[in-house]
Amino acid sequence: MAVTACQGLGFVVSLIGIAGIIAATCMDQWSTQDLYNNPVTAVFNYQGLWRSCVRESSGFTECRGYFTLLGLPAMLQAVRALMIVGIVLGAIGLLVSIFALKCIRIGSMEDSAKANMTLTSGIMFIVSGLCAIAGVSVFANMLVTNFWMSTANMYTGMGGMVQTVQTRYTFGAALFVGWVAGGLTLIGGVMMCIACRGLAPEETNYKAVSYHASGHSVAYKPGGFKASTGFGSNTKNKKIYDGGARTEDEVQSYPSKHDYV
């Protein structure tokens, strides 16, 4: 029972984590304009892995994709790669773990097979989580490195998106989403690996016993029959996530109801 719970919880935690990694990858707020020097700006900049956006205080938001591949810095490409690898590994891990779940019966699958699949998915989740954490951390390090450089040009050649001396960037919401999601995926993976140990069939010390019947010699090996739950799961797993794309219709939040500027 504890094994099933650990496996199920590991699966759910990993599912949430991978949904978070996908959301973080799609979000535009990887870096947001630092407002320390200009808290009353009428133009707010934020950037993601795929495009950069400008939100005017008039309520309009304009986003422009990075329509270049060769012009992008290697670090940004590396972050993209890490996040995509994390998503792909996580997705495969989810697929494998669905079939490995103890509460789901598929044909005459042996527990040893389920244990192997659980271990495989667990390892995939761990690597997926590490990829996401690494990707977010590399980007965060890139921001910290550029923060104090007044002539920072982090995105040189990004479709003409060049920072001016005035625009400094700090950690965006996507970084925190990514760190948390990566952590959850990692935890889920560890739980799957722990569950795998409980799923693995233990070696029995019983010897085969021969029962001699008149005219026939039949050998019976105890422990060859396994109990299983006869309930197939018909629940569907739905992944729902917000890609984080901001629109001009989004309700804007402000520090107070009345701002004096």
């Epitope: 304009q33 700006t41 009428a42 133009v43 900049n45 005017e56 008039s58 309520g59 309009f60 402000y254």
Partner: antibody, heavy 118, light 113 residues
């Protein structure tokens, strides 16, 4: 077409308050910030503040030291600007103007002359 | 606050001649995120409210004659009327749209010589 129609001219005593209205039509009033700008006789333009009618959010110029209150009524598509503790130097034409893409004021009301005189 | 300074205060130009109005801001109006200058030009004729002419320093508002053009970046901007017409007699204002409070230049009065 977009139209901003302001209330008529007012004559006020020093120390009193004035409330100017601005009725909008021809666009989704709730979705655009409304600015208030004043112009003293023979002088330049001076931004006072703005309101987002959709949620009542406001931003004010620090110069007016809490003397100005901007409100909006979504049901009538009307924005209001109230200026209290009036002084003679508050004599000016007060304009409402819609805030648009590019942080510009693209449509303006016809203006309301407020005269502060004892 | 960003201070907007226009020069000259008044300008007299002959019909058909070029008129140039300058505007200087105390801080940059160039936004790094989209490489746009948040500088707007307005025209105000006597007894009328201001009219939007040019935004983002150089983008003409629809319906504005092409004799009006804007240029400049960062802190220095220019409004140019290539061939002055009688109906262009007005006061011209530049406005900062980059930072609160939104501020205007003191205005430049354009007259016919």
């Amino acid at each position: 077409q977009v139209q901003l129609v302001q209330s008529g001219a007012e004559v006020k005593k020093p120390g009193s308050s004035v409330k100017v209205s601005c009725k909008a039509s021809g666009y989704a009033f709730s979705n655009y910030w409304m600015n208030w700008v004043r112009q003293a006789p023979g002088q330049g333009l001076e931004w006072m503040g703005q309101i987002y009618p959709g949620n009542g959010d406001t931003k004010y110029s620090g110069k007016f030291n809490s003397r100005v209150t901007i409100t909006a009524d979504e049901s009538t598509s009307t924005a209001y600007m109230e200026l209290s503790s009036l002084r003679s130097e508050d004599t000016a034409v007060y304009y409402c103007a819609r805030f648009y893409y590019g942080n510009v004021m693209d449509y303006w009301g016809q203006g309301t002359l407020v005269t502060v005189s004892s | 606050d960003i201070v907007m300074t226009q020069s000259p205060d008044s300008l007299a130009v002959s019909l058909g001649e070029r008129a140039t109005i300058n505007c200087k801001s105390s801080q940059t109006l160039l936004n790094g995120g989209n490489q746009k200058n948040y500088l707007t030009w307005y025209q105000q004729k006597p007894g009328q409210p201001p009219k939007l002419l040019i935004y983002w320093a150089s983008t003409r508002e629809s319906g504005v004659p092409d004799r009006f053009s804007g240029s400049g970046s960062g802190t220095d901007f220019t409004l140019t009327i290539s061939s002055l017409q009688a109906e262009d007699v007005a006061v011209y204002y530049c406005q900062n749209g980059y930072s609160y409070p939104l501020t205007f230049g003191q205005g430049t009065k354009l007259e016919i010589k």
